[in-house]
């Protein structure tokens, strides 16, 4: 008999959290916290904010930001984008493989100048050994990090 | 040869749906339907809202609410938190795993006073053996149920 | 020994991408690229919009739809809502499985007419083999197809 | 670090126009953040005048509105408050400070020395 | 506008006393107050933010509660330079207001 997984043979799975130095400010990914609190790998690894593939294979990746912001400087109309996109040795720019664009500034009222929104963004892909996925934010200074729970970032193959 | 799940030994999984007797007022979390309709249990258990894990292990845990409103009464928060909490023996205290804040009331018009919103959360975490997790949210008030298509809370192994 | 797949019984998944053509403007569910970029069908096909279920299980399913506009015209119904749902030879009527509502042109303003907001829906579902499941937006000439990333929807076996 | 220092006339006529300016060292204007105009009569507490962004969005206390103008002066990394038709209940030390708007920290962390303002003929 | 009532209005205490001031709002605000020290002839400085967020370089004997519409600003152990005057401000609609001071002496 075959079977697809030997127990040895853990499925890969990850659960990357939001740590107070995930804003880089330099134009790069978000980077994320790997070991602490809720934030693990297995069978996957991380380098510079990037979840790599040890084994290829089809994977459902997802994110979750929490956005935030005191009324709208930016202006009412700024869009914030979230995305999961893929590095690949074979191409030379990062591929987008999930993006939501959202108009959170229309949350916030007269009434209530501190708004919040939240983007989340999941979905099957298949990744190769040695691809690597990562999480941009545009403006992702309306990001809010600090406590893990509320900005997110796993995977796990199916 | 050893395989990781014998066929006897079914992927725990659960989806529990929103239902009149979801909210209960109390300040405690919300409560689920278990078996009607697309509601099922297989391979964890359930107890006063909360899902209970019998076998340990990674499962990616998510919950959806629909939220609703005429307005927004000065008595309702402006901010609405939706969360996913973990409870386990070991600790007094529920533990934050994922967690959203929303301004949904941003939503409304003045040409239709009538808003709609939906929190979705989903992660990879955790769970041992008779640890719990529930979904709350604050305020309630604004959860709408209906059919158990638009709220609901489930689990699987990965 | 008996074990739950084999390596030739591969995990039934499925992950497939807005198109041009995929809104119809006739009535019925979105329509969806199966082969290029990123869609593809593993142990699952695909008939007019549906995803077709050729082994018998639970599966967690998903969407996404990008919503976008300019101002809210009056045509537009000031609630979108998005759905999954499914189809049975059992029953003639299509069955709700996971909707939202949203209300996203509360996100426009005087200032800024253009909007973005987006929508996630997931769970688990039991699917016999030949049930389908289809999504449906209304009002779909809201919804923001462009590059596939932004609107697709997917499902795997759990 | 970004550091606030307001200019501008320490007395005005009355029914005259108060100008006062706030100039920017340490950082860009051009970022996430509300610039604040802050009043405080003497031996009395903190009042918000109102605020302006980098991209000229501006919210103002409904009890001054028909009588303040504020503006940025991008080029300059400055902006400026001006407020009309004053009388001698506008005499007070005005701050300026910057609050900042993005997700993870809020409120009003910089803050100018301060300049006294007297309405009087 | 939203009102923000502070007491006491005003407080003798020694050093080394554990110190509370309330701060009131005339409705819910949820966790969007700050609370600043002022001393005489110098601007407002932050202590806290969102509640309960202590601002970076602020000691740790200052900490904020509450949420919604009762806040509340505890000083662990008074040392000689708190002495000063301290104000609640919310930030959660317009207009922006502050309560009107709570003035802590030395006894």
């Known amino acids: 008999l075959i079977q697809e997984r030997r127990s040895h043979e853990v499925n890969p799975a990850a659960h990357l959290t939001g740590a107070n130095s995930s804003l880089t400010g330099s134009g790069g990914p978000l980077l994320w916290e790997t070991q602490l609190g809720l934030a693990f790998l297995r069978g996957l690894s991380y380098h510079d904010g990037a979840l790599v593939v040890t084994k290829a294979g089809y994977y459902y990746i997802y994110s979750k930001v929490q956005l935030g912001g005191v009324g709208c400087p930016l202006g009412l109309a700024s869009t914030i984008t979230h995305g999961l996109y893929k590095r690949t040795p074979r191409y030379p720019e990062e591929l987008e493989l999930l993006v939501s664009q959202q108009s959170p500034c229309g949350r916030a009222t007269s009434s209530s100048r501190v708004w919040w929104d939240s983007s989340f963004l999941g979905g099957v892909v298949h990744l190769e050994a040695g691809e690597e996925v990562v999480v941009r934010v545009l403006d992702e200074r309306l990001v809010r990090l600090r406590d893990g729970t509320r900005s997110y970032f796993g995977a796990f193959m199916v | 040869l050893i395989q990781e799940r014998r066929s006897h030994e079914v992927n725990p999984a659960a989806h529990l749906t929103g239902a009149n007797s979801s909210l209960t007022g109390s300040g405690g979390p919300l409560l689920w339907e278990t078996q009607l309709g697309l509601a099922f249990l297989r391979g964890l258990s359930y107890h006063d809202g909360a899902l209970v894990v019998t076998k340990a292990g990674y499962y990616y845990i998510y919950s959806k609410v629909q939220l609703g409103g005429v307005g927004c009464p000065l008595g309702l928060a402006s901010t609405i938190t939706h969360g996913l909490y973990k409870r386990t023996p070991r600790y007094p205290e529920e533990l934050e795993l994922l967690v959203s804040q929303q301004s949904p009331c941003g939503r409304a018009t003045s040409s239709s006073r009538v808003w709609w919103d939906s929190s979705f959360l989903g992660g990879v975490v955790h769970l041992e053996a008779g640890e719990e997790v529930v979904v709350r949210v604050l305020d309630e008030r604004l959860v709408r149920l209906r059919d158990g298509t638009r709220s609901y809370f489930g689990a699987f192994m990965v | 020994l008996i074990q739950e797949r084999r390596s030739h019984e591969v995990n039934p998944a499925a992950h497939l991408t807005g198109a041009n053509s995929s809104l119809t403007g006739s009535g019925g569910p979105l329509l969806w690229e199966t082969q290029l970029g990123l869609a593809f069908l593993r142990g699952l096909s695909y008939h007019d919009g549906a995803l077709v279920v050729t082994k018998a299980g639970y599966y967690y399913i998903y969407s996404k739809v990008q919503l976008g506009g300019v101002g809210c015209p009056l045509g537009l119904a000031s609630t979108i809502t998005h759905g999954l749902y499914k189809r049975t030879p059992r029953y003639p009527e299509e069955l709700e499985l996971l909707v939202s509502q949203q209300s996203p042109c509360g996100r426009a303003t005087s200032s800024s007419r253009v909007w973005w907001d987006s929508s996630f829906l997931g769970g688990v579902v039991h699917l016999e083999a030949g049930e389908e499941v289809v999504v449906r937006v209304l009002d779909e000439r809201l919804v923001r197809l462009r590059d596939g990333t932004r609107s697709y929807f997917g499902a795997f076996m759990v | 670090q970004v550091q606030l220092q307001e200019s501008g006339p320490g007395l005005v006529k009355p029914s005259g126009t108060l100008s006062l300016t706030c100039a920017v060292s340490g950082g860009s204007i051009s970022s996430i953040n509300w610039w604040n105009w802050v009043r405080q009569p003497p031996g009395k507490g903190l009042e918000w005048i109102g605020e302006v962004s980098h991209s000229g969005i501006t919210n103002y206390n409904p009890s001054l509105k028909s009588r303040v103008t504020m503006s940025v002066d991008k080029a300059k990394n400055q902006f400026s408050l001006k407020l009309n038709s004053v009388t001698a209940a506008d005499t007070a030390v005005y701050y300026c400070a910057r609050e900042r708007a993005v997700a993870d920290y809020h409120g009003m962390d910089v803050w100018g020395q301060g300049t006294t303002v007297t309405v009087s003929s | 506008a939203i009102q923000l009532t502070q007491s006491p209005s005003s407080l003798s205490a020694s050093v080394g006393d554990r110190v509370t001031i309330t701060c009131r709002a005339s409705?819910?605000?949820?966790?969007?107050l700050a609370w600043f020290q002022q001393k005489p002839g110098k601007p407002p400085k932050l202590l806290i933010f969102d509640a309960s967020d202590l601002e970076s370089g602020v000691s740790s004997r200052f900490s904020g509660s509450g949420s919604g519409t009762d806040f509340t600003l505890t000083i662990s152990s008074l040392q000689p330079g708190d002495f000063a005057t301290y104000y609640c401000q919310q930030f959660n609609s317009y207009p922006i207001t502050f309560g009107q001071g709570t003035r802590l002496e030395i006894k």
């Open positions: 409705q819910g605000i949820s966790s969007a």
